[in-house]
């Protein structure tokens, strides 16, 4: 079944490369298990950032060596992306899967477009 | 309808604070005189940002201490705004006015949305 | 703040002459071409002609030609219209105003009578 | 000759909604201005290219263009609105600016 999922349409990444936005799900049911996954839209072609599986019990855990950390509260899961370049500007989708118990729900957001810019080397100092 | 004015819905300034954009302008006359205008767009508060009149022989020079420059090809304008910091991120609009000979012809562009990060400090040398 | 200031408005016996002027202030005033539109009393408005924003270019009515000529100096931030062989139709408040219409001035009344 | 045509007058009661016409004999092509004369007072311009308002002119001014009509509307006149009203286009039969002949407006009571 659809489910409506919300995210800002746009987010800056920082100087450092970071980005922050919220994905937030809408469900009639409690789910014990939600699965969230970041793709990256380019063209047709979508491709998976990161992905984390948490329950209402314990907290949002990505894999170590993802680019993703992320805290959940209730039906909103905060996301962060780590090492942006100006060559990963594009558009973020959030996927969000109740995954347990039944009845199985997806949905994905219209997708965030995220804009990065190269910071300009600071000057060696000798 | 007035006259067409097209601009990039989105620019990043780069991280010196620098941001550039084409304004094309759509008019059947051959005007002598252009001044071309970038406003700010605030809710529904229009400020100037810069402003400049330009020949078909001369080229475009805006005041020495305008946060602006620019060059001229025909029918477009090579707008490039300098000097911007995070809290000037928002929407530029090209404003075109056709000033001699007449007819007087003025068209504004949708806006170009721009993004302004601010570069994180450089560590002391020391 | 913006201000276009005429002046030389007179009284003056048809075929005469008169020079009027108008400064400008608070805008690059060598960025824009400027206009001359006059009001006859309980009239409406009527475009006596502009000049381009260099000076090498005029145009003017048909009612004027030949008779009136537009002028400017950029360093004076000053426009000037020069009529000669005045009519007592050319009775009216004389306005500058920049080419687009933004700027007005607040006008100077030439009168010609006899 | 494209001669612009406006009302000579119009009248309207306190907070009303006015609109003033300004016709040219042919389907003009070219942008329109509108100008607020108070009494004693030069032109101010209310409207640019058709629709367009200046900063510091209220948003109870709007213009709009079709076809060979152009239109100036008040949302709600005030006492101070009372003035006379110009159009004014370009006309390639005399090669120059043409204005409209004017509109009174009058607030009524």
């Known amino acids: 079944k659809g489910m409506h999922v919300a995210q800002p349409a746009v987010v800056l990444a920082s100087s450092r490369g970071v980005a922050s936005f919220v994905c937030e799900y809408g469900s009639s049911g409690n789910a014990a298990e939600v699965r969230v996954t970041v793709l990256r839209q380019a063209g047709s072609q979508m491709t998976e950032v990161c992905a984390a599986t948490y329950t209402v019990e314990d907290e949002l855990a990505f894999l170590d060596d993802s680019t993703c950390t992320g805290t959940s509260s209730g039906n909103k899961v905060n996301l962060t992306i780590q090492g942006l370049r100006a060559m990963d500007t594009g558009l973020y989708i959030c996927k969000v899967e109740l995954m347990y118990p039944p009845p199985y729900y997806v949905g994905m957001g219209n997708g965030t477009q995220i804009y990065v810019i190269d910071p300009e080397p600071c000057p060696d100092s000798d | 309808k007035g006259m067409h004015v097209a601009q990039p819905a989105v620019v990043l300034a780069s991280s010196r604070g620098v941001a550039s954009f084409v304004c094309e302008y759509g008019s059947s006359g051959n005007a002598a005189e252009v001044r071309v205008t970038v406003l700010r767009q605030a809710g529904s508060q229009m400020t100037e940002v810069c402003a400049a009149t330009y020949t078909v022989e001369d080229e475009l020079a805006f005041l020495d201490d305008s946060t602006c420059t620019g060059t001229s090809s025909g029918n477009k304008v090579n707008l490039t705004i300098q000097g911007l910091r995070a809290m000037d991120t928002g929407l530029y609009i090209c404003k075109v006015e056709l000033m001699y000979p007449p007819p007087y012809y003025v068209g504004m562009g949708n806006g170009t949305q721009i993004y302004v990060i601010d570069p994180e400090p450089c560590p002391d040398s020391d | 703040e913006v201000q276009l200031v005429e002046t030389g408005g007179d009284l003056v016996k048809p075929g005469g002459s008169l020079r009027l002027s108008c400064v400008a202030s608070?805008?690059?005033?060598?960025?824009?071409?400027m206009n001359w539109v006059r009001q006859a009393p309980e009239k409406g408005l009527q475009l006596v002609g502009g000049?381009?924003?260099?000076?090498?270019?005029?145009y003017y009515t048909d009612a004027v030609k030949g008779r009136f000529t537009i002028s400017r100096d950029n360093a004076k931030n000053t426009v000037y219209l020069q009529m000669n062989s005045l009519r007592a139709e050319d009775t009216a408040m004389y306005y500058c105003?920049?080419?687009?219409?933004?700027?007005w001035g607040q006008g100077t009344l030439v009168t010609v009578s006899s | 000759q494209a001669v612009l045509n406006q009302p000579a007058s119009v009248s309207a009661a306190l907070g009303q909604r006015v609109t003033i016409s300004c016709n040219t004999n042919?389907?003009?092509?070219?942008?329109v201005q509108w100008y607020q004369q108070l009494p004693g007072k030069s032109p101010k311009t209310i409207i640019y290219?058709?629709?367009n308002r200046p900063s510091g002119v209220p948003v109870r001014f709007s213009g709009s263009k079709s076809g060979s009509t152009a239109t100036l509307t008040i949302a709600g006149i005030q006492a101070e609105d009372e003035a006379d009203y110009y159009c004014?286009?370009?006309?390639?039969?005399?090669?120059?600016?043409?204005f409209g002949s004017g509109t009174q407006l009058t607030v009524l009571g």
């Open positions: 042919i389907g003009s092509p070219y942008d």
């Open positions: 608070g805008f690059t005033f060598s960025d824009y071409p």
């Open positions: 290219g058709n629709s």
């Open positions: 000049i381009n924003s260099g000076g090498s270019a005029t």
């Open positions: 004014q286009s370009y006309d390639d039969n005399v090669d120059g600016y043409v």
């Open positions: 105003a920049t080419s687009n219409f933004q700027y």
